[in-house]
C-alpha cells in the first residue's frame, strides 16, 4: 500500500511544484520524493523497506498520476542510497537518495528544489507547504492529482511533550501541526517547503494522522547536508 497521505489538503496548482516526485513500486505510487539535483531524488528510507523484489522508478513532471501529460516521464533508478544509520524501527535518519538512470530533462514542470544548508531551526509558526499523492481521507481515498496543504511549524519543546511525541523529536527532526490537516504515511519522502526552500522530508514512521496531539514529523535536511553532499558528489 502507498506509504502516506495528505489529509485536509487541496488540489495543487498543476506543475507549480516542479520538484515533486512520485516514487513508484511496480508502477504504483509508493512515496513522495523531491528532485534535489538533475539526477537525484531525495525521499524517505523506510519507503523502500518492503520493496526488495519490486521495480522502483521515479515519476517526474506529473500532476495527475493516470492522465497523459507532456511533462511526465518515468525514470528507472540506477542506485538507491538509504542513510547508513536509518533503521526499520526508528524515525531517525529516515532519508533516501535515489540516483536516476539518467539526468532528468529539466523544464517548467521539472526542476530541482534548493535545499536548506544552514543548520538552524525554522521559526515556529512559519507556514510550510507539503504536497503528495497519499490518500486524502480516513476512508482511504487516493487522489489522482497532486494535493497540498499548508502547515505551521511547531516548536520542538511542544512537540516533545509527553502528550505529543514524548521526547522522540531530536534536533535532526522538526514538527508541524496536525489539526485535521496533516501529512501522513503515504506522503512519506515528500517535501516540506518553507519560503521556497526544502526544509524537511516527511518521515515514514507509522503514527495517527490529523490528530493535533500527534504532530507531523519531518527530517531536517540541513542536518544531513554533509551526507547529501557526499552522496551527490
Amino acid at each position: 500500500p502507498p506509504r502516506g497521505r495528505i489529509l485536509g489538503g487541496r488540489e495543487a496548482e498543476a506543475h507549480a511544484r516542479p520538484y515533486m516526485a512520485s516514487v513508484q513500486l511496480n508502477g504504483a505510487h509508493l512515496c513522495g520524493g523531491v528532485l534535489v539535483a538533475e539526477q537525484w531524488v531525495l525521499s524517505a528510507a523506510h519507503c523502500l523497506e518492503d520493496a526488495a523484489d519490486g521495480k522502483v522508478q521515479v515519476l517526474l513532471g506529473a500532476h495527475s498520476l493516470s492522465q497523459p501529460e507532456p511533462s511526465k516521464r518515468l525514470y528507472d533508478v540506477l542506485r538507491a542510497v538509504p542513510h547508513p544509520d536509518s533503521q526499520p524501527d526508528t524515525i531517525d535518519h529516515d532519508l533516501l537518495l535515489l540516483q536516476l538512470s539518467e539526468k532528468a530533462t529539466l523544464g517548467p514542470a521539472v526542476r530541482p528544489l534548493p535545499w536548506q544548508r544552514v543548520d538552524r531551526d525554522v521559526a515556529p509558526g512559519t507556514l510550510c507547504d507539503v504536497a503528495g499523492w497519499g490518500i486524502v481521507n480516513h476512508a482511504g481515498r487516493r487522489p489522482d492529482s497532486l494535493q497540498h496543504v499548508l502547515l505551521p511549524v511547531l516548536d520542538r519543546a511542544t512537540c516533545n511533550r509527553r502528550t505529543h511525541h514524548d521526547g522522540a523529536i531530536t534536533e535532526r527532526l522538526m514538527c508541524a501541526e496536525s489539526n485535521r490537516r496533516d501529512s501522513c504515511k503515504g506522503d512519506s519522502g515528500g517535501p516540506l517547503v518553507c519560503g521556497g526552500v526544502l526544509e524537511g522530508v516527511v518521515t515514514s514512521g507509522s503514527r495517527v494522522c490529523g490528530n493535533r496531539k500527534k504532530p507531523g514529523i519531518y527530517t531536517r535536511v540541513a542536518s544531513y547536508a554533509a551526507w547529501i553532499d557526499s552522496v551527490l558528489a
Partner: antibody
Framework: EVKLVESEGGLVQPGSSMKLSCTAS????????MAWVRQVPEKGLEWVGN????????YYLDSLKSRFIISRDSAKNILYLQMSSLKSEDTATYFC?????????????WGQGTSVTVSS | DIQMTQSPASLSASVGETVTITCRAS??????LAWYQQKQGKSPQLIVY???TLAEGVPSRFSGSGSGTQFSLKINSLQPEDFGSYYC?????????FGGGTKLEIK
C-alpha cells in the same frame, strides 16, 4: 453565522493591566487559529498575536511579547488577551479575528472591536 | 520582519471608474497576500486572500493579482459602497504585517 464579540474596553492607568475577551459563535472554535489585531485611532492595523488551535502555541509581535498573553478556552469558545504594564502607546481599538481555514494568517472574520485608552 | 508598502496613500475616484491599489513586500512572499476593506468606525473585512482568491460574498468587480513582491487590487466599476480604506497584509508567516493603507474617497 460566524460571530466574534469582544468585551468592553475602557480607560486604564499606565502600568496597570487589562484582560479582553472575545466570544466566538457560529463555527467550531477549536478548528481555527485566532488572532488579535489593534488599530491606533486614524492609523493603520497592527497584528498583536496569534494562538493555535488548542492554545499550545502562541505567537506575538516582538515588542509586545513580554507584556501580552493570548489564551483560549475551547470549552467556552472564548479568546483572551491579557495586557499588563500598559503604556500610552497601547491605546487602540483591539479586534479579535479568526484565521482563514487554510491560509491561517489571513483573517476572514473580525469582531466589532473594543476601545482601550491608557491614560492618567 | 517583512515590510509592506502600499500606494497611493489616498485616492479620489468617481462611481463607475476603475481603480488599482498596489502593495510591495520587502521580500518574496510568494502568493501569500490578503486585502481588507475598512469603512469608518467598522472592523476590517477580508476581500481577497492568497493574492487572487475572493473571500465569501465579495463581488466579482474586485480582483487581485501579483506574486513575489509586487501585488495589486483592482476594483472595476466602483460602487458607492466601495469607498473606504484598503489594507494589504502578507499572510506568509510570523509576524503577518499590514501595509499603511489606501484611503479611497469619492471625487
Amino acid at each position: 453565522e460566524v460571530k466574534l464579540v469582544e468585551s468592553e474596553g475602557g480607560l486604564v492607568q499606565p502600568g496597570s493591566s487589562m484582560k479582553l475577551s472575545c466570544t466566538a459563535s457560529g463555527f467550531t472554535f477549536s478548528d481555527y487559529y485566532m488572532a488579535w489585531v489593534r488599530q491606533v485611532p486614524e492609523k493603520g492595523l497592527e497584528w498583536v498575536g496569534n494562538i493555535n488551535y488548542d492554545g499550545s502555541s502562541t505567537y506575538y509581535l516582538d515588542s509586545l511579547k513580554s507584556r501580552f498573553i493570548i489564551s483560549r478556552d475551547s470549552a467556552k469558545n472564548i479568546l483572551y488577551l491579557q495586557m499588563s504594564s500598559l503604556k500610552s502607546e497601547d491605546t487602540a481599538t483591539y479586534f479579535c479575528a479568526r484565521g482563514e481555514d487554510f491560509y491561517l494568517y489571513a483573517m476572514d472574520y473580525w469582531g466589532q472591536g473594543t476601545s482601550v485608552t491608557v491614560s492618567s | 520582519d517583512i515590510q509592506m508598502t502600499q500606494s497611493p496613500a489616498s485616492l479620489s475616484a468617481s462611481v463607475g471608474e476603475t481603480v488599482t491599489i498596489t502593495c510591495r513586500a520587502s521580500e518574496n512572499i510568494h502568493s501569500y497576500l490578503a486585502w481588507y476593506q475598512q469603512k469608518q468606525g467598522k472592523s476590517p473585512q477580508l476581500i481577497v486572500y492568497n493574492t487572487k482568491t475572493l473571500a465569501e460574498g465579495v463581488p466579482s468587480r474586485f480582483s487581485g493579482s501579483g506574486s513575489g513582491t509586487q501585488f495589486s487590487l483592482k476594483i472595476n466599476s466602483l460602487q458607492p459602497e466601495d469607498f473606504g480604506s484598503y489594507y494589504c497584509q502578507h499572510h506568509y508567516g510570523i509576524p503577518p504585517t499590514f501595509g499603511g493603507g489606501t484611503k479611497l474617497e469619492i471625487k
